[in-house]
């Protein structure tokens, strides 16, 4: 049916098809008829057609040249059908704040080219959406992106120079939103080779939850067409895309502080994302800053969180301490960072669910250590889990309801650290409540910011 | 809950063939890839075979390529393994594992059955 | 091709013991490395993916690190259920295993 002579060109033409059907059209092998070459289905006609559609050549049903030369152009290895979002109203990543890593650089480029491509890929996504990223250099991040050839560790080895020049996979865990790129081409900050910075605008919309776009003007087209990187804008449909996914620059409006600027400390209305003590000292965090309050001294210093902890995101939202461990463990979405000594460990960020927590638990509200029963907290929501810091698991008989068990606190808290050996301070919204856990009930109604002399 | 349901193991003599079939239910089996995995006795573990969401792509260890054929009837949430010309080292319990992934396959599996036996031996 | 070798290959330990189980990639898997648990006659269980994430439901006295072509998998202190086999994994290609004995 696609090709009625046998000729050897032809037969290879018909297996070189059938693959590229198979990879990116979904066409089942197994259940062609074992004489190839006299189709009586039309399983590959119709596949042939689906391509042709939606890449936008002329529909025929035919291995024609046109058709053929589509075949053999550089492209995406994600496949065009079964289109990548793959579940409904996912995957996306449920979080705006987002870290990649670069695990190895090309050596076809400087190492400034590649972070520098790599960056502006990334800022043409955050440009149009509330997304924030961040490149960290140690630790796990959310997008790993890696330069390899051939077999490299996922299922789909490369093919060698030219062919498929790179692969993504959606939001997730683990391999999910990394970004490979095929070592066999040659990487470029121009015309020549295969343009860094265009390849990987392509790839990081397949990290963030984009599937192919049939509009060849989009990025998100499964081909690779080089256009002048300085005058390079996203399509409407490329935008149109992404911004069903997260919404548009604007939704970060939504948070209190959308500037980022540093907040006023005595606004009556401050609230804090997290507190916990560390040491002799105390640390309040909201967005990017966190201040420093030493224990009985009025002074009060206002730092960044990333010019202590430069590899740390901003927004931390809950934090808590062991101090006999000089162990502070800061959280942001499903995500934790343990510091020692003031020092952030490597091989973090780890997942917050090897606490124990069940996989419905997305981020942690607040949490707090207390020393004589060896026991965490976290409040997640309008419950709370207990976890032996001993035994390393969660206790039995979590979560509990927040109202039932701490009288006059919920039904959710923002922060909340311990004091003094026998208090929790909870923080709700601009107010704190002084919790003597012995008595088990409220001792003092504070505003926020009480400790710094407002 | 996902639950991964093995069949169709049994004695077969070296040359002949057999149908593995795995009935998956407890997620939605369309969006997911699928793959084989075995296990000779008082052996380790060998991948054998594994399949995109769409069934569309498949891959195949070396021992078993030309000889298994791995499927799927999303349809009727059922994964297939034919294995024509057996030999005796393919005996072992037939494991069918659900990536984490299913446009692309992670190689991470999630969930596992319990395995079917396949005995080839005359 | 891809191979994974894991050591060592059988390991005699007590309950509260410290265990280490380690394996290694002839080229860099970056941290596409999975750990499971198996006991005999049951199939395997995922405990940790990507090197060092811990799958849900699974005790935090299992950890695992590394990335590149060198990782271990860590139990901190042996419980009596924690007597198996454990495999590493990387896509297709599984560790020989290593078996967890009782001393």
């Known amino acids: 049916l696609p090709l009625n002579s046998s000729t050897s060109l032809e037969k290879n033409n018909v297996l070189f098809g059938e693959r590229y059907l198979e990879k990116f059209y979904g066409l089942e092998i197994n259940k062609l008829p074992v004489t190839k070459m006299k189709y009586s289905g039309n399983l590959m006609k119709e596949k042939i057609q689906e391509m042709q559609h939606f890449l936008g050549l002329k529909v025929t049903g035919q291995l024609d040249t046109s058709t053929l030369e589509m075949m053999h152009a550089p492209r995406c290895g994600v496949p065009d059908v079964h289109h990548f979002r793959e579940m409904p109203g996912g995957p996306v990543w449920r979080k705006h704040y987002i870290t990649y890593r670069i695990n190895n650089y090309t050596p076809d480029m400087n190492r400034e080219d590649v972070d520098y491509a790599i960056r502006k890929a990334f800022q043409v996504w955050s440009n149009v959406t509330p997304l924030k990223f961040s490149k960290i250099n140690t630790g796990m991040a959310d997008i790993l992106v890696v330069f390899a050839r051939g077999a490299h560790g996922d299922f789909h080895a490369f093919d060698g120079k030219g062919g498929i020049l790179a692969h993504a996979f959606g939001p997730g865990s683990g391999i999910g939103g990394d970004a490979h790129f095929d070592e066999d081409e040659f990487w470029t900050t121009h015309s020549g080779g295969t343009n860094l910075f265009l390849t990987a605008v392509h790839e990081i919309g397949h990290s963030l939850g984009l599937g192919h776009s049939s509009d060849p003007k989009a990025v998100m087209f499964p081909t690779y067409k080089y256009v002048d990187i300085n005058t390079f804008r996203l399509s409407a449909d490329d935008i149109r895309g992404i911004q069903s996914l997260y919404g548009d620059p604007k939704e970060n409006q939504r948070l209190p502080n959308p500037d980022n600027s540093e907040p006023a400390l005595c606004d009556p209305n401050l609230s804090f994302d997290a507190v916990t003590t560390v040491g002799n000292k105390i640390f309040f965090f909201k967005d990017r800053f966190f201040w420093l309050k030493v224990s009985e001294r009025p002074k009060t210093s206002v730092n960044l969180i990333s010019s202590l902890w430069p590899t740390l995101p901003s927004g931390i939202e809950a934090a808590y301490e062991i101090e006999a461990r000089n162990q502070v463990f800061l959280f942001k979405d499903d995500k934790y960072w343990l510091i020692s000594n003031l020092r952030p460990e490597p091989n973090y960020p780890k997942s917050i669910h090897s606490f124990g927590f069940p996989n419905f638990v997305k981020k942690i509200d607040a949490a707090v250590f207390n020393p004589r029963f060896y026991r965490t907290y976290f409040f997640v929501d309008n419950q709370y889990w207990r976890y032996d810091e001993r035994r390393q698991m969660m206790d039995p008989g979590y979560p509990k309801l927040i109202t039932k068990n701490f009288q006059g606190i919920g039904p959710k808290i923002d922060a909340v650290f311990y004091s003094k050996n026998k208090y929790y301070y909870f923080f709700q919204g601009s107010n704190q409540f002084e919790y003597d856990f012995l008595l088990q009930r409220i001792t003092k109604t504070l505003k926020s910011n009480s400790w710094f002399g407002c | 809950e996902v639950q991964l349901l093995e069949s169709g193991g049994g004695l077969v003599q070296p040359g002949g063939s057999l149908r593995l079939s795995c009935a998956a239910s407890?997620?939605?089996?369309?969006?997911?890839?699928m793959h084989w995995v075995r296990q000779a006795p008082g052996k380790g573990l060998e991948w054998v075979s594994g399949i995109v969401s769409s069934g569309g792509e498949t891959f195949y260890a070396d021992s078993v390529k030309g000889r298994f054929t791995i499927s799927r009837d999303n349809s009727k949430n059922t994964l297939y393994l034919q294995m024509n010309s057996l030999r005796a080292e393919d005996t072992a319990v037939y494991y069918c594992?659900?990536?984490?992934?299913?446009?692309?396959?992670?190689?991470?599996?999630?969930?596992w059955g319990r395995g079917t036996l396949v005995t080839v031996s005359s | 091709d891809i191979q994974m070798t894991q050591s060592p290959s059988s390991l005699s330990a007590s309950v509260g013991d410290r265990v280490t189980i380690t394996c290694r990639a002839n080229q860099s898997i970056y941290t596409y490395l999975n750990w499971y648990q198996q006991k005999p006659g049951k199939a395997p269980k995922l405990l940790i993916y990507a090197a060092s994430s811990l799958q849900s439901g699974v005790p935090s006295r299992f950890s695992g690190s590394g990335s590149g072509t060198d990782f271990t998998l860590t139990i901190s202190s042996l419980q009596p259920e924690d007597f198996a086999t454990y495999y590493c994994?990387?896509?297709?290609?599984f560790g020989q295993g290593t078996k967890l004995e009782i001393k």
């Open positions: 407890g997620f939605t089996f369309s969006w997911y890839g």
């Open positions: 594992a659900k990536d984490i992934r299913g446009v692309f396959l992670s190689g991470l599996f999630d969930h």
């Open positions: 994994q990387q896509a297709g290609i």
